[in-house]
């Protein structure tokens, strides 16, 4: 055993930015730190065979399988994958270990399987076996967390039925509004399923796994807060649990809270109360209304009343199926080149949506913000003044919604010209879409002021590049015009731009560009 080399097998995961086939080399990529694969001598095998722990990667992932060999002298090697030999270039690192790598770029089904590395050193021969498989992420789910009361305790349990099992955390905040943003110092996170401290201002539970993060806020009516101008509304689907918390603070304990649904007191077992003294000796009471599995008849106005505070209500609406309500008519905007502008979509949805903004086949992250009227808004400002078509897409498992926006940037035309044997052509992408004039330059008209009235064909907006319209104008050449200079000019309300073309030239041959504002 002492004669055998010390072998270390590692996996390096790369951030994808290129695609290619497996390469047995080092390759410049942004990489995560190497992960040990626990290479060990395979028991009862003929010959010296080391085996690495099975590697499971996502489709399209880029990885490097790497072997580090502590062995004196030179080594030679050969990779074998599905009976094909792949060349192998060992090198030595700073610790003088032999390093052999196999890069797999953009993992596909065909690249999954057993990779065998045969190494020959001056002392011995041995084989290293890597098994690479593709992770079945189709079975992964991430469900929004929900609350349950803990048996025989005044505590809430947060549950998220997700695969892989998620990490569940409570996100607590005792401030109001903006200061309760996720990374604010006012926010406290507790990585546990059970929460006993239920008196806080803002209570959320979040679940996260490989698919991301989903949160649920504990719906709260605070009798010490001024009621919203619009009645708070809570949507739930049939079968989901309902939890509403009513909270009130008073100078002493001489007050009580009650819940009513449509002016009828809630049944015993549908609520529970907790109370505590705050640091300034005032009494805080909270009263939870809960239904473990809602039905259509749980819809209605839930009112929390106090003997010492004005009552407040919330409208609970039970739906059969989730929804996304918003106007899907497309919207067109035109802005100046340096004008600040954001696209905006206002919607009401349940369950909460996942959304993306897309431009030019590129997706951008989508943020959404709840408004006081029960609606939410998503804004997109990162358009960098690029004209074209922008798409907002939202889905929540039950419903899908798509809205199209067109952004036009007001600017002076810029002309591109080209000539062939039979015609001259000019195109421009300015906005508003330009109009065209063609002028002939001759001895009689050295300033190119002679109009060309015939043979001009204008095509407005013939080419749509990601929603960006382009206008073009073509001049069909007559024999009489050959050898002449002509000028095409595009103009709109912001200015004019011209190109001069020598007719009879075989390729793109603009040689003077005028800009007339």
């Amino acid at each position: 055993n002492q004669d055998l080399p010390v072998i270390k097998c590692v996996l390096i995961n790369h951030k994808n930015n290129d695609s290619s086939v497996g390469k047995s080399s080092s390759y410049p990529m942004v990489s995560e730190s190497p992960e040990d694969l626990g290479c060990a001598l395979r028991p009862q095998s003929a010959g010296t065979v080391y085996e690495a722990a099975t590697v499971e990667v996502d489709v399209s992932a880029s990885i490097t399988l790497q072997v580090l060999v502590d062995t004196p002298g030179n080594i030679s090697c050969l990779w074998v994958f599905k009976h094909s030999s792949l060349n192998c270039q060992p090198h030595f690192d700073v610790q003088n270990r032999g390093v052999v790598s196999m890069v797999i770029l953009k993992m596909t089904e065909t690249q999954a399987g057993e990779y065998l590395l045969f190494i020959q050193s001056e002392a011995t021969n041995y084989t290293i076996l890597f098994t690479v498989s593709i992770r079945n992420t189709l079975l992964f789910t991430l469900r929004r967390p929900y609350f349950r009361k803990m048996e025989n305790q005044d505590a809430l349990v947060c549950i998220s039925e997700s695969v892989p099992e998620p990490i569940v955390e409570w996100v607590l905040c005792d401030s109001q509004g903006e200061s309760c943003k996720e990374e604010s110092p006012a926010v406290v996170k507790k990585e546990e399923k059970v929460l006993h401290e239920l008196f806080g201002t803002d209570i959320r539970c979040c679940a996260r796994n490989e698919l991301g993060r989903e949160c649920t806020r504990l719906f709260t009516i605070d009798l010490n807060q001024t009621p919203q101008t619009t009645l708070p509304q809570l949507f739930l689907k049939v079968g989901e649990p309902l939890w509403i918390r009513c909270k009130a603070v008073h100078v002493n304990h001489g007050f009580g809270l009650t819940w009513e649904l449509e002016n009828k007191a809630l049944e015993e077992g549908s609520y529970f109360e907790m109370s505590t003294y705050s640091t300034n000796r005032t009494m805080i009471r909270i009263l939870f209304a809960f239904v473990s599995s809602v039905a259509r008849n749980d819809t209605g106005y839930y009112t929390c009343s106090s003997s010492k505070h004005p009552s407040q209500s919330a409208l609970v609406t039970i739906v059969e199926k989730g929804f996304i309500n918003a106007t899907n008519s497309s919207e067109d905007y035109e802005i100046d080149q340096y004008e600040e502008f954001c696209f905006s979509v206002r919607f009401k949805a349940y369950p909460q949506i996942r959304c993306t903004w897309t431009f030019s086949r590129k997706s951008f992250p989508c943020e959404q913000k709840g408004l006081d009227d029960g609606y939410s808004v998503s804004k997109f400002c990162n358009h960098k003044h690029q004209p074209g078509e922008y798409i907002f897409h939202a889905e929540n498992g039950d419903a899908q919604f798509t809205k199209m926006f067109t952004l036009n940037i007001r600017r002076k035309p810029q002309v591109l010209a080209e000539a062939s044997a039979s015609q001259a052509s000019c195109s421009s992408d300015g906005y508003p879409l330009p109009s065209w004039t063609w002028k002939k330059c001759s001895d009689k008209s050295p300033n190119c002021t002679e109009d060309i009235p015939e043979g001009v064909w204008n095509r407005k907006a013939n080419r749509k590049v990601f929603g960006q319209w382009v206008s073009s104008s073509t001049l069909n050449m007559s024999e009489a015009m050959k050898g002449f200079l002509v000028k095409c000019c595009a103009y709109n309300s912001l200015g004019t731009s011209c190109e001069t073309i020598l007719l009879n030239s075989p390729g793109p041959f603009p040689f003077i560009q005028d800009s007339i504002s």
């Epitope: 996996l11 995961n13 992960e35 040990d36 694969l37 626990g38 060990a40 395979r42 028991p43 009862q44 085996e51 690495a52 722990a53 099975t54 590697v55 499971e56 990667v57 990885i63 057993e114 076996l129 098994t131 695969v163 892989p164 099992e165 490989e210």
Partner: antibody, heavy 124, light 107 residues
Framework: QVTLKESGPTLVKPTETLTLTCTFS??????????VSWIRQPPGKCLEWLAH???????SYSTSLKSRLTISKDTSKSQVVLTLTNMDPVDTATYFC????????????????WGQGTMVTVSS | DIQMTQSPSSLSASVGDRVTITCRAS??????LAWYQQKPGKAPKRLIY???SLQSGVPSRFSGSGSGTEFTLTISSLQPEDFATYYC?????????FGCGTKLEIK
Amino acid sequence: QVTLKESGPTLVKPTETLTLTCTFSGFSLRYARMGVSWIRQPPGKCLEWLAHIFSNDEKSYSTSLKSRLTISKDTSKSQVVLTLTNMDPVDTATYFCARMPEYSSGWSGAFDIWGQGTMVTVSS
Amino acid sequence: DIQMTQSPSSLSASVGDRVTITCRASQDIRNDLAWYQQKPGKAPKRLIYAASSLQSGVPSRFSGSGSGTEFTLTISSLQPEDFATYYCLQHNSYPLTFGCGTKLEIK
């Protein structure tokens, strides 16, 4: 270099819940099929296996302690967490976490690397 | 659950001695057995896996044998650093189970 390090309270009161964290580096439970187990050893006594979590999130627990144990992992933080409820003085022990690679040909090398252990005392 | 019975529970020996420790499984575990060495205040260290495969970096005086239900760990010539407690572990099926250890002391 592969390391595992246990952390958590050194003193716990009876009936309380113990939460221990195993933070590891040099390997991951995201891409390689690996598992992490918790093992404990009361002073001067035998090693006792408690729970195991696989990279695919499957779990296995000691028969005698199943009702009190929960094991979970946070792949992004390279952590495995063990909770043991309703602690009793007999749960006083050094708690270890250890890694177990899984090989495609079906054999296993058991625990190849261990953490240094953390001593937990249960006392009122 | 599979029970692992380790014997002897303690053993006195001298440097240079040949020592054998036995582990018996209550049912067939094929060769899914590992041997660990533990020194006071330290974590266990793997010596043997898959019943007979020597851990990389472990001296060749350590060897393992057996299959099914009977397993042995042999130290061919004891060295001063070998005085420690040795444990067997079956990892054939969950729950995993350890033997209760053999304490190897200097005679």
